[in-house]
């Protein structure tokens, strides 16, 4: 088979491509090359007649093409417009045509890219940086490298402009890295020099070390401050609000009780213009103190917050103990103690975590207990409960609804009827109700501290009695052993019991009968002719009860295997033959007869007077039910003796 191979397939601009012909037939008249996928005279590049060895340029000839005696076509100094399909049309000496199509793609040689940035010193958590890979080149793929790795997946990293632009939103200090871009096309790949992103950040909240806050008289106090910052932070120390010195370390020898107080370290970043401070309270004891509990969250929210209880003061070489509800700590994955047992963390607090909590410091002689601390856990509101649970009321009675939702602080309640606000109370009272008071009653519970709201909606129907139900069916004429039927009791009513009767009896137990949808739907799987019965549904509630009219199921079945009567198969010559065929079927079947395979008549009864031995043979009765689409038959042999 004639084929064209492009060497190479992807061609760089300015280079050359050879459209190499394989399996060129023998005995040729000539051949012609075309731009495109078909023989099109308007797009002929060049024609070549073998006998004359003469090449004739066509309308699409550019002067850059050379045709060879083996039909291959060389295109030199390739330009972008040369991309696409080329068709060779070969005419054999017997004027039989053959053609083959090849193609190649043209791409530019890429220059070395460079990265431009819209922000050389972005500030953490504030600025975005857009890197753009220059220059813009068509049909090029743009790739990015961070620290010589491909881009990590991050919602803060966004590629746009055909991957040419890399945007880092809300830069962080971790974005300080070496960035490179790469341009690729099928003929070249070039990578830029790296650009280092210098993210200005901080200062973070300073850390004062050591963490120890309790000292004995006569010790040296040596505090060091550090805050992550770019450029590095400048530090200042304050004691009880009074400036001390602009150094990273503070040293006070031979301290006394008078050196107790608040020690503040301030870190300042001149480029971001931000200041951050950390305060530590230093206590200098003359003797061991009574412990006390501090909490990082006085009003934690249930299932949201964690609470860290810390036993103060911090004393070196001391054992800390904890009690909850006057018991030692229970084992729980939500309770965590720090390494030194000084901090007890309750993860994801619940309303049961109120306490009381006590901590103790053990010394050589005794255990000093702190005062008990009770947690005020904010929770709820839970889903409100509306009571009483009735949904049907008779006209003329009083409607008194009460709403309650577990909540701390206690919930504030609102009532809405059909979406309209009524009152901001826990109870709703309407006297002497009428049918107009039917509707959607919504109780909304709101916890002002947690900001959470929960609602419960109740449908109230004021009616003297339930309506008469009716039965709807998804299949009025089901086919036996094939179809299922779903009866549904209408209407759908809340707080209503649904009942079913078949032929005046309660439902039989059967794997083919299934109640669903709160007993409102009765499904009969794989119906049988025995299911053709009267079905009644009933609804009842505390006010009234009612039954539907019966619905009779019309099951299509059959035809069953027919029976030919009389059963006799031997007859005497001269007798009358009177055969009757019957098959159980709904609707009634159509009957037809065949004698020895030959169609006779379309009747239920076949009558032949004064039969002879010539009437010997096979008598077949065929039955057909057009509604079920099913057929059946039976064959009987009749012998007539002389």
């Amino acid at each position: 088979k004639l084929t064209i191979e492009s060497t190479p397939f992807n061609v760089a601009e300015g280079k050359e491509v050879l459209l190499l012909v394989h399996n060129l037939p023998q005995h040729l008249f000539g051949y012609s090359w075309y731009k495109g996928e078909r023989v099109d005279g308007n797009r002929q590049i060049i024609g070549y007649v073998i006998g004359t060895q003469q090449a004739t340029p066509g309308p699409a000839y550019s002067g850059r093409e050379i045709i060879y005696p083996n039909a291959s076509l060389l295109i030199q100094n390739i330009i972008q417009n040369d991309t696409g399909f080329y068709t060779l049309h070969v005419i054999k000496s017997d004027l039989v045509n053959e053609e083959a199509t090849g193609q190649f793609r043209v791409y530019p040689e890429l220059p070395k890219p460079s990265i431009s940035s819209n922000n050389s010193k972005p500030v953490e958590d504030k600025d975005a940086v857009a890197f753009t890979c220059e220059p813009e080149t068509q049909d090029a793929t743009y790739l990015w490298w961070v620290n010589n790795q491909s881009l990590p997946v991050s919602p803060r990293l966004q590629l746009s402009n055909g991957n040419r632009t890399l945007t880092l939103f809300n830069v962080t200090r971790n974005d300080t890295a070496s960035y490179k871009c790469e341009t690729q096309n099928p003929v070249s790949a070039r990578r830029s020099d790296s650009v280092i992103l210098n993210v200005l950040y901080g200062p973070d909240a300073p850390t004062i070390s050591p963490l120890n806050t309790s000292y004995r008289s006569g010790e040296n106090l040596n505090l060091s401050c550090h805050a992550a910052s770019n450029p590095p932070a400048q530090y200042s120390w304050f004691v009880n609000g009074t400036f001390q010195q602009s150094t990273q370390e503070l040293f006070i020898p031979n301290i006394t009780v008078n050196n107790s107080g608040s020690y503040t370290c301030q870190a300042h970043n001149s480029d971001t213009g931000l200041n951050r401070t950390t305060v530590t309270t230093i206590t200098v004891y003359a003797e061991p103190p009574k412990p006390f509990i501090t909490s990082n969250n006085s009003n934690p929210v249930e299932d949201e917050d964690a609470v860290a209880l810390t036993c103060e003061p911090e004393i070196q070489n001391t054992t800390y103990l904890w009690w909850v509800n006057n018991q030692s700590l229970p084992v729980s994955p939500r309770l965590q103690l720090s390494n030194d047992n000084r901090t007890l963390t309750l993860l994801s607090v619940t309303r049961n975590d109120v306490g009381p909590y006590e901590c103790g410091i053990q010394n050589e002689l005794s255990v000093d207990h702190s005062d008990p601390v009770i947690l005020n856990v904010l929770y709820g509101p839970d889903d409100p409960t509306i009571s009483p649970s009735y949904t049907y009321y008779r006209p003329g009675v009083n409607l008194s609804l009460s709403c309650h939702a577990a909540s701390n602080p206690p919930a504030q309640y609102s009532w809405l009827i059909d979406g309209n606000i009524q009152q901001h109370t826990q109870e709703l009272f309407i006297s002497n109700i009428t049918e107009k008071n039917s509707g959607l009653y919504t109780c909304q519970a709101n916890n002002s501290a947690s900001g959470h709201s929960r609602t419960t909606v109740k449908t109230i129907t004021v009616s003297a009695e339930l309506p008469k139900p009716s039965i709807s069916s998804n299949n009025s004429k089901p086919v036996e052993d094939k179809d299922a039927v779903a009866f549904t009791c209408e209407p759908e009513a809340q707080n209503t019991t649904y009942l079913w009767w078949v032929n005046g009896q309660s439902l039989p137990v059967s794997p083919r009968l299934q109640l669903s949808n709160g007993n409102r739907t009765l499904t009969l799987f794989n119906v049988t002719r025995n299911d053709a019965r009267a079905y009644v549904c009933g609804i009842q509630n505390s006010v009234s009860a009612n039954r539907s009219d019966p619905v009779t199921l019309d099951v299509l079945y059959g035809p069953d295997t027919p029976i030919i009567s009389p059963p006799d198969s031997s007859y005497l010559s001269g007798a009358n033959l009177n055969l009757s065929c019957h098959s159980a079927s709904n609707p009634s079947p159509q009957y037809s007869w065949r004698i020895n395979g030959i169609p006779q008549q379309h009747t239920q009864v076949l009558f032949i007077a004064k039969i002879t031995p010539n009437n010997n043979g096979t008598y077949a009765c065929f039955v057909s039910n057009l509604a079920t689409g099913r057929n059946n038959s039976i064959v009987k042999s009749i012998t007539v003796s002389a």
């Epitope: 005995h27 008249f29 000539g30 012609s32 078909r38 023989v39 099109d40 005279g41 308007n42 002929q44 024609g47 007649v49 073998i50 006998g51 004359t52 003469q54 004739t56 049309h89 005419i91 054999k92 000496s93 017997d94 004027l95 039989v96 045509n97 053609e99």
Partner: antibody
């Protein structure tokens, strides 16, 4: 502009032969193929065969195989079509036509051959 | 052999009308199809080659389209000199075959 000039009308008896000539001018004779096509009264156009003058390669339609001979004389830029064993149904206008890269592009004026006893 | 079927076999139209003639091949012939115009007593004249290419010197009101088995010749605005018989011809197979012709007459 390529021109194909054919020989004049001929009247022939059944069983005889006829030889029709076709002279090319205004273009190179040998950079194409010469086809012969006929049109009998009430019939459509019917291709008979061709020749590539430069190498003498000829091809014929199955229907005329054995009765038709197509030749070319490169020195005079003339092609010939000879049809033998003539019968009355061979009465037709016979055309020579040039075939290049896109099938037939130029036609001769036609030669009427009448076969009658 | 490849059979070529033209339709209609004859057509009446007026000057200025747009006319379309179709040609169907019994098997695919790619774009190896020509359209010819023939006037009484004259040799056929090539109008369209390779299904859609206009032969040099032919007015631009003539156009061809199609590929595979179905082809169309369109005359966008009939001129008095266009009343003639039009033939399609396939050259996919060296047994060149022609359509039976469409006679274009003045209405």
């Amino acid at each position: 502009q390529v021109q194909l000039v054919q020989s004049g009308a001929e009247v022939k008896k059944p069983g005889s032969s006829v030889k029709v000539s076709c002279k090319a001018s205004g273009g190179t004779f040998h950079d194409g193929a010469i086809s012969w096509v006929r049109e009998a009264p009430g019939q459509g156009l019917e291709w008979m065969g061709h020749i590539i003058p430069i190498d003498g390669t000829a091809g014929y339609a199955q229907k005329f195989q054995g009765r038709v001979t197509i030749t070319a004389d490169e020195s005079t830029s003339t092609a010939y079509m000879e049809l033998s064993s003539l019968r009355s149904e061979d009465t037709a206008v016979y055309y020579c036509a040039r075939y290049r890269f896109y099938g037939i592009d130029y036609w001769g004026q036609g030669t009427l051959v009448t076969v009658s006893s | 052999d490849i059979q070529m079927t033209q339709s209609p076999s004859s057509l009446s139209a007026s000057v200025g009308d747009r006319v379309t003639i179709t040609c169907r091949a019994s098997q695919s012939i790619s774009s190896y199809l020509n359209w010819y115009q023939r006037k009484p007593g004259k040799a056929p004249k090539l109008l369209i080659y390779a299904a859609s290419s206009l032969q040099s010197g032919v007015p631009s009101r003539f156009s061809g389209s199609g590929s595979g088995t179905d082809f169309t010749l369109t005359i966008s605005s009939l001129q008095p000199e266009d009343f003639a018989t039009y033939y399609c011809q396939q050259w996919r197979s060296h047994l060149f075959t022609f359509g039976q012709g469409t006679k274009l007459e003045i209405k």
